[in-house]
Interface confidence: low
């Protein structure tokens, strides 16, 4: 199947630059005076609207209105062509992309305007491609697609499991929901035998057991983000500090080498990512503790960059696993720390999973193709892709995304493989709540 | 255009270098494949270079005989140990470029004929 | 080593027919995989790229599908023009080496 929407793939051209240039608005960054307390809640609001309007900006003039395929051509500036265009072979002209054919959907110094996605059978096209919008395709009704298995549409489930109410309906992009009729958790299992399966229509509504579940999520939710305001005032803050670098002030890498419409998640998503990581307190389902934590932690409790995605889901704050944070243990530059370390990776990761591992983690799919023309030899391909990462994100690619991105895709033990190897090597220890001293 | 060169008459055993030659495009920017038939045979893959890096695939049966390389405007096609099975017209092949493999451009082929 | 199994080896059909050819995978390669029409003494010429989408001016009437490892080719109303050898090239770019592999041809014969 082809690439679709945040995945859409880039052409080559074999240049350097394939993000997209200084005109990609990036969002307003809070400045150095902004109190501390207030940055966790305008980061979060910064995210939505810069969301918004990132859908919003992307607007496509009619085809009528354009000129004909090929035959527009204007000068580039600083040496990028607008979306909709591509540069030419001596890099004097923007060319027009094809309407319905091809589009590019940032400033750009691509040799080629980016393919269209065809919509597979068992897909709907909700928007045709234009000269600056990728196709987008959707599951048809009855069905839905997973991030983790993007490459086709899944029959959504008929019901909940015996004991279990429905809360969301089958979504193009969901299965149905469930949660137990108690607690209002979650129900994160497998998909349930026909016999314990308890059927609902699509509109049924959740019942007022689960809506004060619900309601009761929000409400944790909301003190959780409370008690982080007054967490970032205390001790720990100046502990934190170091490590994050400016980060609640705007700083870290350039965002504008960061190309939003690939990067999962977004470089201003890890930075909210990384603070929520080291605020937020979860809990850790009993039947994942084996897996998941190899010592018990005695300082800080954290909540992963992935699972901190899902911060305004309060049901979703029930599958959250306890993190603690990996920080290099000479106080080294992280992301350099983490490259010394992918040397490794290669036999931790199980190789079918590098290609998902690596558009998990936001290279497109020319990227990869090139990385692995790129690397020496079989072994050294997923090395080449994740430098080509690293490159690619700059500061933004962190441990925590990394780790993330294997537990998205279900790769628990080459995650905790991988934890172990950042301990074992003495390159990251745990950040401690009161101590310095590392735990393996 | 793409255009191979190179191709002769020679006997097994003597070394050849094959010649890819571009006009109205950089080389560096490709993906570059050699392709040869053999006469009144299919299209058999012989490997490719990602001209930006340099990097270099080979299929299994070339089994180091042949090596390919480039400069800033062709690829060559080096080949040693030659034998009679390695008669055939050998073309070059330009992929577009774009996230899929799509061998849009091609040369027109130059003959090697290996024989005693 | 990937192996394409190109089916069948000749095929005719008189003008306005259709011609299915069908090559299989050894293994999976997504929609890796793309179409080559040749004319003697000519190079191969690009028809189907990622199983399914046309090249630039190539005539609507060739198609290109996929199921799971297997790929098809389609030609409605062929024409005399469309007389050629027909191949397909699969890739599994994932492995270095035998990554490339064309299936054995297809002579198309029209009547």
């Known amino acids: 199947m082809e690439q679709r929407g945040q995945n859409a793939p880039a052409a080559s051209g074999a240049r350097k630059r394939h993000g997209p240039g200084p005109r990609e608005a990036r969002g307003a960054r809070p400045g150095p005076r902004v109190p501390k307390t207030l940055v966790l809640v305008v980061a979060a609001v910064l995210l939505l609207v810069s969301a918004e309007s990132a859908l919003i900006t992307q607007q496509d003039l009619a085809p009528q209105q354009r000129a004909a395929p090929q035959q527009k051509r204007s000068s580039p500036s600083e040496g990028l062509c607008p979306p909709g265009h591509h540069i030419s072979e001596d890099g004097r002209d923007c060319i027009s992309c094809k309407y319905g054919q091809d589009y590019s959907t940032h400033w750009n110094d691509l040799l080629f305007c980016l393919r269209c996605t065809r919509c597979d059978s068992g897909e709907v096209e909700l928007s045709p491609c234009t000269t600056t919008r990728n196709t987008v395709c959707q599951c048809e009704e009855g069905t839905f697609r997973e991030e983790d298995s993007p490459e086709m549409c899944r029959k959504c489930r008929t019901g909940c499991p015996r004991g279990m109410v429905k809360v969301g309906d089958c979504t193009p992009w969901s299965d149905i929901e469930c949660v137990h009729k108690e607690s209002g958790t979650k129900h994160s299992g497998e998909v349930p035998a026909v016999e314990e399966t308890v059927t609902s229509s699509p509109g049924t509504p959740a019942s007022p057991c689960s809506l004060s579940g619900i309601i009761i999520g929000v409400t944790v939710a909301a003190v959780v983000l409370i008690v982080a305001v007054f967490v970032c005032k205390s001790l720990l803050w100046k502990k934190v500090l170091p490590y994050l670098k400016g980060i609640c002030s705007g700083g870290g890498g350039d965002p504008e080498r960061v190309d939003r419409s690939s990067q999962r998640p977004g470089a201003e998503d890890n930075v909210l990512n990384e603070i929520v990581s080291i605020l937020q307190p979860t809990q850790v389902p009993e039947q994942e503790m084996e897996v998941q934590e190899p010592a018990e932690p005695t300082g800080v409790n954290m909540l992963s960059p992935g699972e901190s995605e899902h911060l305004l889901e309060p049901a979703e704050a029930e599958r959250s696993q306890r993190r603690r944070l990996l920080v290099p243990a000479n106080e080294g530059d992280p992301t350099e720390t983490l490259r010394q370390c992918f040397d490794d990776f290669a036999d931790l990761v199980p190789f079918d999973s590098w290609e998902p591992l690596m558009r998990k983690l936001g290279l497109m799919d020319n990227e990869i193709k090139v990385a692995k023309a790129e690397a020496a030899g079989h072994r050294d391909t997923l090395y080449t892709m994740l430098i080509k990462w690293v490159n690619k994100t700059g500061r933004d690619a962190s441990v925590h995304t990394l780790l993330d991105a294997l537990e998205t895709l279900g790769e628990r033990l080459a995650k905790q493989k991988i934890e172990d190897h950042l301990l074992s090597s003495g390159k990251f220890m745990y950040l401690e709540g009161n101590a310095d001293s590392a735990m393996s | 255009s793409l255009e191979e060169s190179g191709g002769r008459l020679v006997t097994p055993g003597t070394p050849l270098t094959l010649t890819c030659t571009a006009s109205?495009?950089?080389?560096?920017?490709?993906?570059m494949s050699w392709v040869r038939q053999a006469p009144g045979k299919g299209l058999e893959w012989i490997g490719y270079?990602?001209?930006?890096?340099?990097s270099t695939w080979y299929a299994s049966w070339v089994k180091g005989r042949f090596t390919i390389s480039k400069t800033s405007t062709t690829v060559d096609l080096k080949m040693t140990s030659l034998t009679t099975e390695d008669t055939a017209t050998y073309f070059c092949?330009?992929?577009?470029?774009?996230?899929?493999?799509?061998?849009?451009?091609w040369g027109p082929g130059t003959l090697v004929t290996v024989s005693s | 080593a990937l192996v394409m199994t190109q089916t069948p080896s000749s095929t005719s059909e008189p003008v306005g027919g259709t011609v299915t050819i069908k090559c299989q995978a050894s293994q999976s390669i997504g929609s890796s995989l793309s179409w080559y029409q040749q004319t003697p003494g000519q190079p191969p010429k690009l028809l189907i790229y990622?199983?399914?989408s046309l090249a630039s001016s190539v005539p609507k009437r060739f198609s290109g599908s996929r199921s799971g490892t297997q790929f098809t080719l389609t030609i409605s109303g062929v024409q005399c023009a469309d007389a050629a050898t027909y191949y397909c090239l699969g890739i599994d770019d994932v492995r270095r080496d035998d990554g490339f592999a064309f299936g054995g041809g297809t002579e198309v014969v029209v009547k």
């Open positions: 109205g495009f950089t080389i560096s920017s490709y993906h």
């Open positions: 092949a330009r992929d577009a470029g774009s996230s899929y493999w799509e061998f849009n451009l």
């Open positions: 270079i990602y001209a930006g890096s340099a």
């Open positions: 990622t199983a399914s």
